[in-house]
Amino acid sequence: APVRSLNCTLRDSQQKSLVMSGPYELKALHLQGQDMEQQVVFSMSFVQGEESNDKIPVALGLKEKNLYLSCVLKDDKPTLQLESVDPKNYPKKKMEKRFVFNKIEINNKLEFESAQFPNWYISTSQAENMPVFLGGTKGGQDITDFTMQFVSS
């Protein structure tokens, strides 16, 4: 692959972890102890896109799976999905825009803004065990702030 990737996990600002919920969905819930092993490990790739000091374009794949988070219109609404790709061709420098997120670091917290849909962010609900989704509001009920934990490769 012509791009660099790091392995990491993400937790939202309420310390909920992300786990698989069926083959093509993530959900957020509190995990403890051995259950932490259920959390999804992402392969975060540094890809082409608009960049500034605190905004870095990344793609979020699931480690050792040919699945990437992507942003598409469904029923005219920006929607987060897990999309299957050909592992021979991914990750790559010029990822299609639907796969690209702007990783924004503010006060040691991370936001992931869709490059395809500006001002739409990877989000979780306050409630437990709910799907991870693409939200169009910041600072409301839904959670858009995450922390990243590095995982040994």
Epitope: R4, K92, F150, S153
Partner: antibody, heavy 120, light 107 residues
Framework: QVQLQESGPGLVKPSETLSLTCTVS??????????WSWIRQPPGKGLEWIGY???????NYNPSLKRRIAISVDTSKNQFSLRLSSVTAADTAVYYC????????????WGQGTTVTVSS | SSELTQPPSVSVFPGQTANITCSGD??????ACWYQQKPGQSPVLVIY???KRPSGIPERFSGSNSGNTATLTISGTQAMDEADYYC??????????FGGGTKLTVL
């Protein structure tokens, strides 16, 4: 502001092992998102990448040198080190350490370099 | 191939534009960067991620990368830009590869 400083012997005998250390100040070798590299430059020649380590991963080495090199880290001293075994005169060079932010795809901070001569 | 090829030397008059090329197989599919090195000094990163300038690097330095060629462009070249310039690229099989370097002479 991150600074790097190489240290080690300036003269090494052929067939011996060259050991160099890079001390990091103003930052941490254990912070994620950075590669920490060694590069060398023989007299009058170009730059040659030796290898790097990433704190959450395994070191990666230049395939042409792989059998002779090892890069390790000492987080307690905030240092990383290079060992190059079975040296010959061809290993005479200025050796640099550098920081490479993962998303930069380039080395943004370099040490001042240390000259190593291989001679008996 | 992981090789990066640069012209050994480029000459330019002060105030003119200098273009230094770096060629390699499918280089445009990789990220390229450029370093400036003056005699007796450590290299300095002048372009990263194909076309980004680190803080402190003058605006006259720019970069591009497509196809098999990355290019460092110095607009309005000054005497102080005389130096050796190295391109570098990365991929997961060879990791870091440097070009052979180009000596820029300001006439």
């Amino acid at each position: 502001q991150v600074q790097l400083q190489e240290s080690g012997p300036g003269l090494v005998k052929p067939s011996e092992t060259l050991s160099l250390t890079c001390t990091v100040s103003g930052g941490s070798v254990s912070s994620g998102g950075y590669y920490w590299s060694w590069i060398r430059q023989p007299p009058g020649k170009g730059l040659e990448w030796i290898g790097y380590f990433y704190y959450s991963g395994s070191p990666n080495y230049n395939p042409s040198l792989k059998r002779r090199i090892a890069i390790s880290v000492d987080t307690s001293k905030n240092q990383f080190s290079l060992r190059l075994s079975s040296v010959t005169a061809a290993d005479t060079a200025v050796y640099y350490c550098a920081r490479d932010p993962m998303h930069y795809y380039g080395m943004d901070v370099w040490g001042q370099g240390t000259t190593v001569t291989v001679s008996s | 191939s992981s090789e990066l090829t640069q012209p050994p030397s480029v000459s330019v008059f002060p105030g003119q534009t200098a273009n230094i090329t770096c060629s390699g197989d499918k280089l445009g599919d990789k990220f390229a960067c450029w370093y400036q090195q003056k005699p007796g000094q450590s290299p300095v990163l002048v372009i990263y991620r194909d076309n980004k300038r680190p803080s402190g690097i003058p605006e006259r330095f720019s970069g591009s990368n497509s196809g098999n060629t990355a290019t460092l462009t110095i607009s309005g070249t000054q005497a102080m830009d005389e130096a050796d310039y190295y391109c570098q690229a990365w991929d997961s099989s060879t990791y870091v590869v440097f070009g052979g370097g180009t000596k820029l002479t300001v006439l």
